[in-house]
Interface confidence: medium
């Protein structure tokens, strides 16, 4: 029994199951499931059987390869699929493939939850904030990763003059993608708060930017 | 010798529950389903539903659903069936079988349970 | 549900007899069947999968056959250690269900 194959996919996207190996030659029947219970189609005796399921309409399959295509795949779909084979023989055999159906990662928006000088040293806490997702977080500084163990969904770190970085990066990322977004200080650590602008990412080409005045006055005039 | 160990008898009072365990020895349940199927005293052989230890899912026979539960322990590769609001109808010998799919080859040796005031 | 309905309900017969037991499902079940030897106190034994296929271990005297509503369980020599009572069970759909039984009595 066994034959388990995991795959993750990005959510509206077109699925093919399919095995690795070549079918029993001249099986008697296949038939595809979904979950335990329900049959999604049959193929018997020359003939494809597609059930009443809410894959009716989306789905097809190929008896030559024993492939199941699934079009247009929603986080709903999330499920093992079986495929169950009887041979000419009488035996019977199944295979299962675990799907994972993930929506894309949405655009992060960064926060700056706070940011003090402190002798020549800048301590900076910034959190990354998306809709409740099961991601990764990477950091970085000016476009160089910080170290492993702050990845997390808040960057708290002290900064010295020698390491300040402009611009910080958040990306989040799951198994099918993954997004940026980038806040930048201006000067390093000493903002005014009434003097901070947010500019939309599409004032700046998909990236979101804290600016101070001057740099909004600048950006206009290029 | 793959075998499925079950635990021993239980008596119980009309509205108490059960817990029967299931433990695989020879094996663990990695990729397995285990199903639990009852029989009467002097009755046939009734399925009652299905887990699989490797994913999560189960499914119930309509009849004894909202008062069934099918849980496992991965690490001792132990199935639990827990039945509850016990009739005296639920008394029975009730077995897990398995390794298979789509047939039972392998059964426990069955848990009787009786249900009495 | 996908009812079966098994007969005879019992059998009695000699050591040697041709034994016969038939189940009858109440929709097409393809090859989906399973037949189960019970004797009294111990759990049942699988006999024959998927219609005609004799399960490892089991006497070849053991044989099915049949698809889609009509299946047969044939002993082809009855021994004394055949007796116990007899299930089929369609192994299509969920929930999965069992014939009532057939009680095969040795004379």
């Known amino acids: 029994q066994g034959h388990l194959v995991h795959m993750t996919v990005v959510s509206g996207s077109n699925v093919t199951l399919n095995i690795s190996e070549s079918l029993p030659e001249n099986y008697k029947q296949l038939t595809w499931f979904y979950t335990f219970d329900q049959k999604i189609v049959e193929w018997d005796s020359r003939k494809s059987k597609y059930f009443e399921s809410k894959f009716k309409g989306r789905v097809r399959l190929d008896p030559q390869s024993g492939a199941l295509y699934i079009s247009k795949v929603q986080k709903e779909d999330n499920s093992t699929y079986i495929m169950r084979v009887l041979k000419k023989t009488g035996n019977e055999q199944e295979w299962k493939i675990k799907l994972q159906v993930l929506d894309p990662v949405p655009k992060p928006v960064i926060k700056i939850e706070k940011i003090e000088d402190m002798d020549d040293n800048c301590y900076l806490k910034l959190s990354c904030v998306i809709p409740g997702e099961s991601v990764n977080y990477t950091w970085y500084g000016d476009k160089r990763p910080f170290p492993k163990e702050l990845q997390n969904s808040v960057l708290e770190t002290t900064l010295m003059p020698h390491n300040y970085s402009r611009c910080y990066t958040c990306q989040v990322s799951n198994s099918v993608s993954s997004k940026n977004g980038t806040v930048c200080l201006s000067p390093p650590c000493t903002l005014a708060r009434s003097e901070q602008k947010l500019i939309s990412e599409e004032d700046l080409g998909g990236e979101q930017k804290l600016i101070s005045e001057e740099d909004l006055h600048h950006h206009h005039h290029h | 010798q793959v075998q499925l160990v079950q635990s021993g008898a239980e008596v119980k009072k009309p509205g108490a529950s059960v817990k029967v365990s299931c433990k695989a020895s020879g094996h663990t349940f990695t990729n397995y389903y285990i199903h639990w199927v009852r029989q009467a005293p002097g009755q046939g052989l009734e399925w009652m539903g299905i887990t699989n230890p490797n994913d999560g899912n189960t499914r119930y026979a309509q009849k004894f659903q909202g008062r069934i539960s099918m849980t496992w322990d991965t690490s001792t590769s132990t199935v639990f069936m827990e039945l509850s609001s016990l009739k005296s109808e639920d008394t029975a010998v009730y077995y897990c079988?398995?390794?298979?799919?789509?047939?039972?080859?392998?059964w426990g040796r069955g848990t009787p349970v009786t249900v009495s005031s | 549900d996908i009812q079966m309905t098994q007969s005879p309900s019992s059998v009695s017969a000699s050591v040697g007899d041709r034994v016969t037991i038939t189940c009858r499902a109440s929709?097409?079940?393809?090859?989906?069947l399973a037949w189960y030897q019970q004797k009294p106190g111990k759990a049942p034994n699988l006999l024959i999968f998927a219609a005609s296929s004799l399960q490892s271990g089991v006497p070849s005297r053991f044989s099915g056959s049949g698809s889609g509503t009509d299946f047969t369980l044939t002993i082809s020599s009855l021994q004394p250690e055949d007796f116990g009572t007899y299930y089929c069970?369609?192994?299509?759909?969920?929930?999965?269900?069992f014939g009532q039984g057939t009680k095969v009595e040795i004379n």
């Open positions: 929709q097409d079940i393809s090859s989906w």
């Open positions: 069970q369609q192994t299509d759909n969920f929930p999965r269900t």
């Open positions: 079988a398995g390794l298979r799919y789509w047939f039972f080859d392998l």
